[in-house]
Amino acid sequence: SERCDDWGLDTMRQIQVFEDEPARIKCPLFEHFLKFNYSTAHSAGLTLIWYWTRQDRDLEEPINFRLPENRISKEKDVLWFRPTLLNDTGNYTCMLRNTTYCSKVAFPLEVVQKDSCFNSPMKLPVHKLYIEYGIQRITCPNVDGYFPSSVKPTITWYMGCYKIQNFNNVIPEGMNLSFLIALISNNGNYTCVVTYPENGRTFHLTRTLTVKVVGSPKNAVPPVIHSPNDHVVYEKEPGEELLIPCTVYFSFLMDSRNEVWWTIDGKKPDDITIDVTINESISHSRTEDETRTQILSIKKVTSEDLKRSYVCHARSAKGEVAKAAKVKQKVPAPRYTVELACGFGAT
């Protein structure tokens, strides 16, 4: 056949849908690969063709749009399942073409099973709520386009396995779930089940997301350098190992880049000739505040190294700070035999 622009298998868009529920899947060509939309393509005489490869098969085959009750159908650039079955799992391809033009992309679709408590292999989106920040809401995701605005669905919210009713600080409000004051105890998986009628049938959409309560911007502070500090002195003899930890606490800030770095005599360690190694570790608190530790290590320190300035720097969206380590050469204890000899006038 003639050449077709093949965008390959778009694994970035690993689509997961629940078994026995409706699913509407838009052809990714118009969303991510082409500079025009479906309407423009359609009016230019281009046709959208769908086909698929079953799981564990190599054979591409057309999608059967003649199933009972139109279980699988296509509408504009959307492939519909009403509802899905487990064996719909596979790689789906949408191809846009006419006699002179062809472009196609494939994407994986996985139909997953859930248990009665909504546990499943589904990758869950994470919604971050600020701790003790006033009323915040989450919205039942990815339900647009399933039913017309004239249809009024029923929505039931669950936390884990439990229907949300008479909860202290969590109130269901239709498609929204309101958190009056988010607390750590609100961390968990929340599920909305949307039930709506269509052509005499009842369909359910199940959407689960993870709520993570994080540090509030009103509590956020510039980076805090815990060490080095004024209370600690690194007193070393030449030949000993010098280890200086720089430990920095970063408040959680949405989309902030936290950075820690050392300078030695005002230069980055990479730009100087001494043999320095730096190891970093990162830990997080339950509200996603971050502690970064960078340990500066000089295996065999020289007397020159002990005269240098060692400064730890830290930066976040809240500001930049720096702190110098107190490094000095250990004064050797006086040797008794030498002092005694000097006392007797030896030269």
């Epitope: 815990h226 600690v232 690194y234 280890l243 200086i244 340990i295």
Partner: antibody
């Protein structure tokens, strides 16, 4: 996870010395202050001192200055407390406890504690 | 040195009721933005366990029935509703500057 495991119970005579150990795991030992706190039978908590393992910097409560010595072995992530010139009033459970890091640059809390070592001083 | 005075020395409350423990410092342990006052729970035969740090911040894994408040010299630990597993001795602790660490004398909580 963070763990502080202390050495076993000790019985000593007055005037003797004792060296208690506290082995840390689950975190970067050299970057956190290690404290020692004691508790006499039926009494409250009393802070002995603290050490910063990366540098060996130490601070002591005035009461223990000169009699308590805090050291570390960074190769085994172990902290030690040596107490000399023991007297019967030193009979207590001795705890090691780590300071935490938080959004403030001082005033640290003690977030992890060892299980304690009972020291009995008796003639 | 800063002295911490806890009151009462012992406290007996009914299950489900509120327990309030007070800690007074001989001088302020607060600075701009925070108070270096912490609360610990110690059950018989166990090491202390950090409950609240910096006067009001609940430590990870501690039930929300524990809360702390106060600044300057006066601090409060509240437990509500009290449960059987809360039977313990509670200590306040300040760490105002290095190296001055002191503890309150403790408050023993019992169930009526």
């Amino acid at each position: 996870q963070v763990q502080l495991v202390q050495s076993g119970a000790e019985v000593k005579k007055p005037g003797a010395s004792v060296k208690l150990s506290c082995k840390a795991s689950g975190y970067i030992f050299i970057t956190y202050w290690m404290n020692w706190v004691r508790q006499a039978p039926g009494q409250g908590l009393e802070w002995v001192g603290q050490i910063f393992p990366a540098s060996g910097t130490t601070y002591y409560a005035q009461k223990f200055q000169g009699r308590a010595t805090l050291t570390v072995d960074t190769s085994t992530s172990t902290a030690y407390m040596e107490l000399s010139s023991l007297r019967s009033e030193d009979t207590a459970v001795y705890y090691c406890a780590r300071t935490d890091f938080y959004r403030y640059d001082g005033g640290y809390a003690l977030d992890y504690w060892g299980q304690g070592t009972l020291l009995t001083v008796s003639s | 040195d800063i002295v911490l005075t806890q009151s009462p020395i012992s406290l007996a409350v009914f299950l489900g009721q509120r327990a309030t423990i007070s800690c007074r410092a001989s001088q302020s342990v607060s600075t701009s933005g925070y108070s270096s006052m912490h609360w610990y729970q110690q059950k018989a035969g166990q090491p202390p366990k950090l409950l609240i740090k910096y006067a009001s911040d609940l430590e990870s894994g501690v039930p929300v029935r524990f809360s702390g408040s106060g600044s300057g010299t006066d601090f409060i630990l509240n437990i509500h509703p009290v449960e059987v597993e809360d039977i313990a001795t509670y200590y306040c602790h300040h760490s105002w500057g290095i190296p001055m660490y002191t503890f309150g004398g403790g408050t023993k909580l019992e169930i009526k």
